[in-house]
Amino acid sequence: GSGIFQLRLQEFVNQRGMLANGQSCEPGCRTFFRICLKHFQATFSEGPCTFGNVSTPVLGTNSFVVRDKNSGSGRNPLQLPFNFTWPGTFSLNIQAWHTPGDDLRPETSPGNSLISQIIIQGSLAVGKIWRTDEQNDTLTRLSYSYRVICSDNYYGESCSRLCKKRDDHFGHYECQPDGSLSCLPGWTGKYCDQPICLSGCHEQNGYCSKPDECICRPGWQGRLCNECIPHNGCRHGTCSIPWQCACDEGWGGLFCDQDLNYCTHHSPCKNGSTCSNSGPKGYTCTCLPGYTGEHCELGLSKCASNPCRNGGSCKDQENSYHCLCPPGYYGQHCEHSTLTCADSPCFNGGSCRERNQGSSYACECPPNFTGSNCEKKVDRCTSNPCANGGQCQNRGPSRTCRCRPGFTGTHCELHISDCARSPCAHGGTCHDLENGPVCTCPAGFSGRRCEVRITHDACASGPCFNGATCYTGLSPNNFVCNCPYGFVGSRCEFPVGLPPSFPWVA
C-alpha cells in the first residue's frame, strides 16, 4: 500500500462491567475491539469499511491498559494499510465487544455482545506526530491516539509519490522527504541516470559512461579530449581539427617531416653565433669575436679581442685571460697609470696630456715614435699589414702594400671578381665560377651575357609550379625552374618526402 492508518489503543475503562444493553458480563466483560475506517461521512452510516477494518484479540477484562506490541496476536498500534492517495479526511468507528469464547479469535465466536462504540470524523494530514484523544460515555472511557504515515518508498502529503532508492543502470539516487530524487554523487538528469564526466571534459569531443570519466570520440585525445589527433605520421605539425597536419614553422611536406629551418631545429651554431638558413648545408654560422670553425665551435684565444690596454700583454687562462702590464700601468686591463704628467713619463720628446682630471695621462709622440710612453721607434711593416701575399713598403712616415694580380684594397684584402665588370646585360645575375663568369638571365633574355632578346618568352606561360623562379637561356628547352626548398622535378611539381604510394617516387 501507499500508506498506513495507525491506531494506538491506550486504556479502556468499564468499571461496572456492563454491556451496551445494560446487562452485566459474567464473570466480567472479556473485551476485544472492532475498528472500521472509511471515507469521510458527515453522518456515519453502516456499510463497507472503504479504507479498511481490523479486529483485536481479547485485550483485557472490564478496565485495562493496552500495552504496545510489535508483532503477533494483539499487535498495538493497530495497522490499517491503504493503497490509494490519502484524501486527508476520514471516518473511524471503534467498537468494544465482550466475547464468552476464544481469546485469540473472538470475532468468530457466537454470542458476542457490544459494550460501547465511538465514531470520529475529521481531517488528518500525513505525519509522524500522534494525535491523542479520549472518548467517554455513561459507562465506559477509551483513551487512544492515531496517525497516518506513508509506507516504505511512498512520500508526499498524500503518500502518492513513489520513490525507491536505487543505484543501477536505470538510476542512481536516494529519496528526499518529499519524494523527489536526490542524485548520488557523480550523477545528474531527471532520473539521475546521466553520469557527470570528468571536470572540463569537452562537451562535444568527450563523453563518459560513469562519473569522473572522459572517453574521447575518434580524432580526439588528452585527459579532457580537447586535443585533436593529427594525421598519422605527422612529424612536426599540429592540428586544429582531427587528422590535420599543419606544419610548424620551418617544416614542410605532407607529413611536416622536411626541415626548412635547420637553424631553429638543430641549433648547429655554438657559442652565441648567429645561424642563417642558407648555404650548401642549409645553414651558415656567423661567429662572435673569439670563435671560429664551421659551427663556431673552436674558441680562439681569449686574448683575441685585445683586452689589455697601454701595451699590456695578454696571457690566456683556462676560462679567462690575464694582462701583464708594462711598467707604470696596473689594473685588470692595464687601464690605470702609476704616474701622472707631473712625473714626466713621456720619452723621445713626447708631450704629456693629462686625462681623467689628472689621474692619468697620454703621451703625444713625435713622428716615427710610438708606444704609450713614445718609447718605440716605428716600423710600419712589422705587423705584416698586407693580405693575400701583398708586399709591404716603408715610405717615410707611412707604408704602402703592393698587391698581387687579382687583389686590390689598402691591404690587398679585396678579391677582384670576374663579376666586378658587370658582364651580364639586361639585369642578369652574375655567378663567379672557376671557368669564368656565368649569367642567369631574367625572363625574355638569353645568351652567355643575356644579350639576346627572346621574341617568344618561354617563361611567359608560367611553366614552374609551387612558387619556383623561371629562367630562360640556360638550356635547350629555353627555360629552367629554380625550385624552392621542399620541391623537385623539372617544373618543381613534386613535393619532397611523399609517401611511397605516390607513383612518381622511386
Epitope: L339, P345, N348
Partner: nanobody, 119 residues
Framework: EVQLVESGGGLVQAGGSLRLSCAAS????????MGWYRQAPGKQRELVAT??????TRYADSAKGRFTISRDNAKTVSLQMDNLKPEDTGVYYC??????????????WGQGTQVTVSS
C-alpha cells in the same frame, strides 16, 4: 742594477696592524715611483699601493681607508697597514719604477715578505 730589500712582514690577528718598509740600493737610475704589490696564494700579483716622485698615490680598492703609503726619501717607501683582514694575507713585493738607458720604463722587484692575517 737596483736591489730592493723588504722588512716588516709577519703573523698578525685580524684587526691588527703591520708596517712594511722597503729600501733601494745599487746602481740607481731615475726612480719615478715606488710601491707594493701583493700575491695571494693561487692568484696573480696585484697592486696594493704606489707613490710617484710627484707624490701621486694610488691604492687598490681593498686598501683604501686602511693602508697608507709614504716615501721617506727617494730610496725608501713604507706601507702602514691597519685593521688587517684575513683576505690581506699574501706575499708583499716592493717595486720601483725606473728608467733605463734605452730609454723606457722598467719595474724592479724585491724578494717579497710574507704577511699572514689570522681570524
Amino acid at each position: 742594477e737596483v736591489q730592493l730589500v723588504e722588512s716588516g712582514g709577519g703573523l698578525v690577528q685580524a684587526g691588527g696592524s703591520l708596517r712594511l718598509s722597503c729600501a733601494a740600493s745599487g746602481d740607481i737610475p731615475r726612480i719615478a715611483a715606488m710601491g707594493w704589490y701583493r700575491q695571494a696564494p693561487g692568484k696573480q700579483r696585484e697592486l696594493v699601493a704606489t707613490v710617484s716622485n710627484a707624490a701621486t698615490t694610488r691604492y687598490a680598492d681593498s686598501a683604501k681607508g686602511r693602508f697608507t703609503i709614504s716615501r721617506d726619501n727617494a730610496k725608501t717607501v713604507s706601507l702602514q697597514m691597519d685593521n688587517l683582514k684575513p683576505e690581506d694575507t699574501g706575499v708583499y713585493y716592493c717595486y720601483s719604477l725606473a728608467t733605463t738607458v734605452t730609454p723606457s720604463w722598467v719595474n724592479y722587484w724585491g724578494q717579497g715578505t710574507q704577511v699572514t692575517v689570522s681570524s
